[in-house]
């Protein structure tokens, strides 16, 4: 899994008038990390683990960056011509990634009223637009605005790419939290399914980093993919992750089945409780 930093900003307009505030969230490695507190006009860490990433450093840089990006996005929304009556939203999602081979990715996506209409690979400057005519119109509108001051735009987007990666590297380098290894807690439960069958569920929780293998085995051999159900690997709000895998087995054959877990080079097997 690459390390990633994801900015999610939203600005609103009402009856064609762009509202003064903005909403902002930042995710680090898929975990809620920062949000913009509109009352205090400050970037705030999301939970203890986020505070631990920067230790005792202030969040002034993050506050400044989010404020600037919110201002830019409000200006962009003001230039969208087809705003009708009522409430409308413009959302910008920016993601930068550092992969294991040290290669980087950086992308930017614009949504109007929740619909994607423009994406950019920031490193290569390639823009992509969905096929719908509404998306094409919106994209042309926004790109024309961004092109009005080509030099500013060029500088802005390359700086944005560099800044995102620079911030991500800063968090990775300064943080013991992001280099830690937290082994999962594994718990196996059983529940009655239909007559003669039971559903066995294996849950792994509170692990970091995100990469994990969790699978059911019968007599030491992994079951086929289509006989198992997997949950997504989701953040649990504490800077760690959780997931699960379930399968249906015949009652009385529990002893033949084990849950196999592999995480950060360690592995373990877990029996079905009788």
């Amino acid at each position: 899994e690459p390390h990633s930093l994801r900015y999610n900003l939203t600005v609103l307009s009402w009856d064609g008038s762009v509202q003064s505030g903005f909403l902002a969230e930042v995710h680090l490695d898929g975990q809620p990390f920062l949000r913009y507190d509109r009352q205090k006009c400050r970037a705030k860490p999301q939970g203890q683990w986020a505070e631990d990433v920067l230790g005792n450093k202030t969040w002034d840089r993050e506050t400044r960056d989010l404020t600037g990006n919110g201002k830019d996005l409000r200006m962009t929304l003001a230039h969208i011509k087809d705003q009708k009556e009522g409430l409308h939203s413009l959302q910008e999602i920016r993601v930068c990634e550092i992969h294991e081979d040290n290669s980087t990715r950086s992308s930017q996506h614009f949504y109007y009223d929740g619909e994607l209409f423009l994406s950019q690979n920031v490193e290569t400057e390639e823009w992509t637009v969905p096929q719908s005519s509404r998306a094409q119109t919106l994209a042309m509108n926004v790109r024309n605005f961004l092109k009005e001051d080509a030099m500013k735009t060029k500088t802005h987007y390359h700086a944005m790419h560099a800044d995102c990666l620079q911030e991500l590297r800063r968090y990775l380098e300064s943080s013991v939290v992001l280099r830690r290894r937290v082994p999962p807690m594994v718990n196996v439960t059983r529940s009655e399914a239909s007559e003669g069958n039971i559903t066995v569920t294996c849950r792994a929780s509170s692990f970091y980093p995100r990469n994990i293998t969790l699978t059911w085995r019968q007599d030491g051999v992994s079951l086929s993919h289509d006989t198992q159900q997997w949950g997504d690997v989701l953040p649990d709000g504490n800077g760690t992750y959780q997931t699960w895998v379930a399968t249906r087995i015949c009652q009385g054959e529990e002893q033949r089945f084990t849950c196999y877990m592999e995480h950060s080079g360690n592995h373990s097997t877990h029996p079905v409780p009788s």
Partner: antibody
Framework: QVQLQESGPGLVKPSETLSLTCTVS?????????WNWIRQPPGKGLEWMGF???????KYNPSLKSRITISRDTSENQFSLKLSSVTAADTAVYYC????????WGQGTTVTVSS | EIVLTQSPATLSLSPGERATLSCSAT???????FHWYQQKPGQAPRLLIY???NLASGIPARFSGSGSGTDYTLTISSLEPEDVAVYYC?????????FGQGTKLEIK
């Protein structure tokens, strides 16, 4: 109809600078897209060399970075390649191409590096 | 840089047969930045399939593409004699853009 046409000398001496120009018709190079140089040594595969984008940004293949310059002349709707300190290994067919998924190509020009 | 490896290096099939060409990347690629090209002897390459699965203008429907992440496939459902060419995959996710080494398609 978008067309790209490479031009430049077919023979360059070792240690000299290779210079090629791509003339674009049917589309403005400042409107959109990346404008690329790609080469193919005899009997070998394709190598992306670099591009100048619609905004004027240049990106180069790190394997050539110290020797390559791509520039553009917006008034003539042209972009150019300069490759310095050439050797026999730079002998190839040189193509200019539009885009990121290269949708339009020039027909290619053969450049031989030889004394 | 992302290295693309094509397989097989050479494919020799009869007219009407199905051809499957593979391209594997050393790092994950976004499917919208993955493309296939066809190059016939003495000609410039031409875009065949863009963004993994979209047919370029003028390309017959017997060509199709699929894939995601690190593994991509070009399929020709029923080979025609004019399909003799070298086929290249290419990624535009990161700089430098890179091509596979090519698969040479021959007709028996």
């Amino acid at each position: 109809q978008v067309q790209l046409q490479e031009s430049g000398p077919g023979l360059v001496k070792p240690s000299e600078t290779l210079s090629l120009t791509c003339t674009v018709s049917g589309y403005s190079i400042t409107s959109d897209y990346a404008w690329n140089w790609i080469r193919q040594p005899p009997g070998k595969g394709l190598e992306w060399m670099g591009f100048v984008s619609y905004s004027g940004t240049t990106k180069y293949n790190p394997s050539l970075k110290s020797r390559i310059t791509i520039s553009r002349d917006t008034s003539e709707n042209q972009f150019s390649l300069k490759l310095s300190s050439v050797t026999a290994a730079d002998t190839a067919v040189y193509y200019c191409a539009r885009g990121y998924g290269f949708d339009y190509w020039g027909q290619g020009t053969t450049v031989t590096v030889s004394s | 840089e992302i290295v693309l490896t094509q397989s097989p290096a050479t494919l020799s099939l009869s007219p009407g047969e199905r051809a499957t060409l593979s391209c594997s990347a050393t790092s994950s690629i976004s499917s919208i930045y993955f493309h296939w090209y066809q190059q016939k002897p003495g000609q410039a390459p031409r875009l065949l399939i863009y963004r993994t699965s979209n047919l370029a203008s003028g390309i017959p429907a017997r060509f199709s593409g699929s894939g995601s992440g690190t593994d991509y496939t070009l399929t020709i459902s029923s080979l025609e004699p004019e399909d003799v060419a070298v086929y290249y995959c290419q990624q535009g996710t990161t700089i430098p853009f890179t091509f596979g080494q090519g698969t040479k398609l021959e007709i028996k």
